[in-house]
């Protein structure tokens, strides 16, 4: 209806383009823009009971642009979609929906999980840890000498933190019993801590503080690697007992 009025208006005004606002190529006093300059989108804006044409450099949120030889127009995205490239390719879903491959879903497909921050369906990410670093020197109360039963530890880093549905991380540090090297402490060594004496320089960007404590990870799901570790630890305990027997005579 408005468009036909606009056409009548055009017949009454031969110079419809004169005095057009902004990006309008042709316009009328009553209907506003009738057509737009290149690379601009034509959209209808409701003002009270009246719809007027406007020319926009991009379509408003919730609309997408479609090109035709004579006009570029804005069309509404699907009802569940906030921003889109077209009706079939949503780029941001309305609240309560998850985006997956351009579609808005109530629930994510199997094998994917909902990211409630980005409101997307994302791949499940499992924990990844590095190889174990070498065992630390064997120490007892910080000393690396004195024929005592001590402990040694080793650590590994978390390379990839798991997502909500991913496998939790296995422990990132391990401690085992050991025998401090067979030599008497020298005077100067007595108070020196093995950690200070033999500490390797940490790699660039690596800090000891950043290594999570295994205690916080003890409750994690047991994964095959952990089972393996437990078996290894049992073996080690047996070996350690044998060691301690052979060492116990030297006191």
């Amino acid at each position: 209806q408005n468009a036909s009025r606009g056409r009548r208006q055009r017949r009454m005004h031969p110079n419809v383009s004169q005095g057009c606002q902004g990006g309008c190529a042709t316009c009328s006093d009553y209907n506003g823009c009738l057509s737009c300059k290149p690379r601009l989108f034509f959209a209808l804006e409701r003002i009270g009971m009246k719809q007027i044409g406007v020319c926009l450099s991009s379509c408003p949120s919730g609309y997408y642009g479609t090109r035709y030889p004579d006009i570029n127009k804005c069309t509404k995205c699907k009802a569940d979609c906030d921003t889109c490239f077209n009706k079939n390719f949503c780029t941001k879903c309305k609240s309560g929906f998850y985006l997956h491959l351009g579609k808005c879903l109530d629930n994510c497909p199997e094998g994917l999980e909902a990211n409630n921050h980005t409101m997307e369906c994302v791949s499940i990410v499992h924990c990844e840890v590095s190889e174990w670093n070498p065992w630390s020197p064997c120490t007892k109360k910080g000393k690396t000498c004195g024929f005592k039963r001590g402990t040694e530890t080793r650590v590994r880093e978390i390379i990839q933190h798991p997502s909500a549905k991913g496998n939790l991380c296995p422990p990132t540090n391990e401690t085992r019993k050991c025998t401090v090297q067979r030599k008497k402490c020298q005077k100067g060594e007595r108070g020196k801590k093995g950690r200070e004496r033999k500490r390797k320089k940490p790699n660039k960007g690596e800090s000891k503080e950043a290594i999570p404590d295994s205690k916080s990870l003890e409750s994690s799901k047991e994964i095959p690697e952990q089972r393996e570790n437990k078996q290894q630890q049992k073996k080690r305990k047996v070996q350690d007992k044998q060691k301690s027997v052979s060492v116990s005579t030297v006191h």
Partner: antibody, heavy 117, light 111 residues
Framework: QVQLVQSGAEVKKPGASVKVSCKAS????????FHWVRQAPGQGLEWIGY????????GYNQKFKNRVTMTRDTSTSTAYMELSRLRSEDTAVYYC??????????WGQGTTLTVSS | DIVLTQSPASLAVSLGQRATISCKAS??????????MNWYQQKPGQPPKLLIY???NLESGIPARFSGSGSGTDFTLNIHPVEEEDAATYYC?????????FGAGTKLELK
């Protein structure tokens, strides 16, 4: 007129990251989405993803999702594409392009990335 | 993903003759009466250049000897009459679904 000027050629080692820039001029930077497309030597075109310069929202081809990050700087009308954990298969020419009503109508000149040990 | 299969992979055409390139989509790229299929031309060392948008609409500044047709899953690019400067690789591209995809390309050579 619309112009997209990309950063120069890059040579990287496997495992490294690269950040390619695309500076736009001749139009309002926030009006159109920016897309990135790559082309391996003698191969076809492959879409990587997009960014809305107006709000920074981005979306990526699933194939690149865990390795690519797209950002923009509205003050300099520049879009960026960072690709991490590079492998030899990432050797390609990387193009930025403006997306106007479901087609790529303006393209950058391309940035050649070589990944080699 | 929507797979676009272009044929032939290459073709040689004499000056002034017609070149026809086909692009078949693994599923429809139409929605709400619009076909989300575009055609690009690429010459060595240059970025692609938009020729046809929405299956059949000629991009401004592109000569009228280029034309596009088709809907649903079958699309065609025609060049008639072929001129020397048309020697290039031509790609179809769909914008209907995520991820956006391209055909493998058709290389046009002049006889």
């Amino acid at each position: 007129q619309v112009q997209l000027v990309q950063s120069g050629a890059e040579v990287k080692k496997p495992g490294a990251s690269v950040k390619v820039s695309c500076k736009a001029s001749g139009y309002t930077f926030t009006s159109y989405t920016f897309h990135w497309v790559r082309q391996a030597p003698g191969q076809g075109l492959e879409w990587i993803g997009y960014i809305y310069p107006s709000n920074g929202d981005s979306g990526y081809n699933q194939k690149f999702k865990n390795r690519v990050t797209m950002t923009r700087d509205t003050s300099t009308s520049t879009a960026y594409m960072e690709l991490s954990r590079l492998r030899s298969e990432d050797t390609a020419v990387y193009y930025c392009a403006t997306y106007f009503a479901n087609n790529f109508d303006y393209w950058g000149q391309g940035t050649t990335l070589t990944v080699s040990s | 993903d929507i797979v676009l299969t272009q044929s032939p992979a290459s073709l040689a055409v004499s000056l002034g003759q017609r070149a026809t390139i086909s692009c078949k989509a693994s599923q429809s790229v139409d929605y709400d009466g619009d076909s989300y299929m575009n055609w690009y031309q690429q010459k060595p060392g240059q970025p692609p250049k938009l020729l046809i948008y929405a299956a059949s609409n000629l991009e401004s500044g592109i000569p009228a000897r280029f034309s596009g047709s088709g809907s649903g899953t079958d699309f065609t690019l025609n060049i008639h009459p072929v001129e020397e400067e048309d020697a290039a690789t031509y790609y179809c591209q769909q914008s209907n679904e995520d991820p956006l995809t391209f055909g493998a390309g058709t290389k046009l050579e002049l006889k």
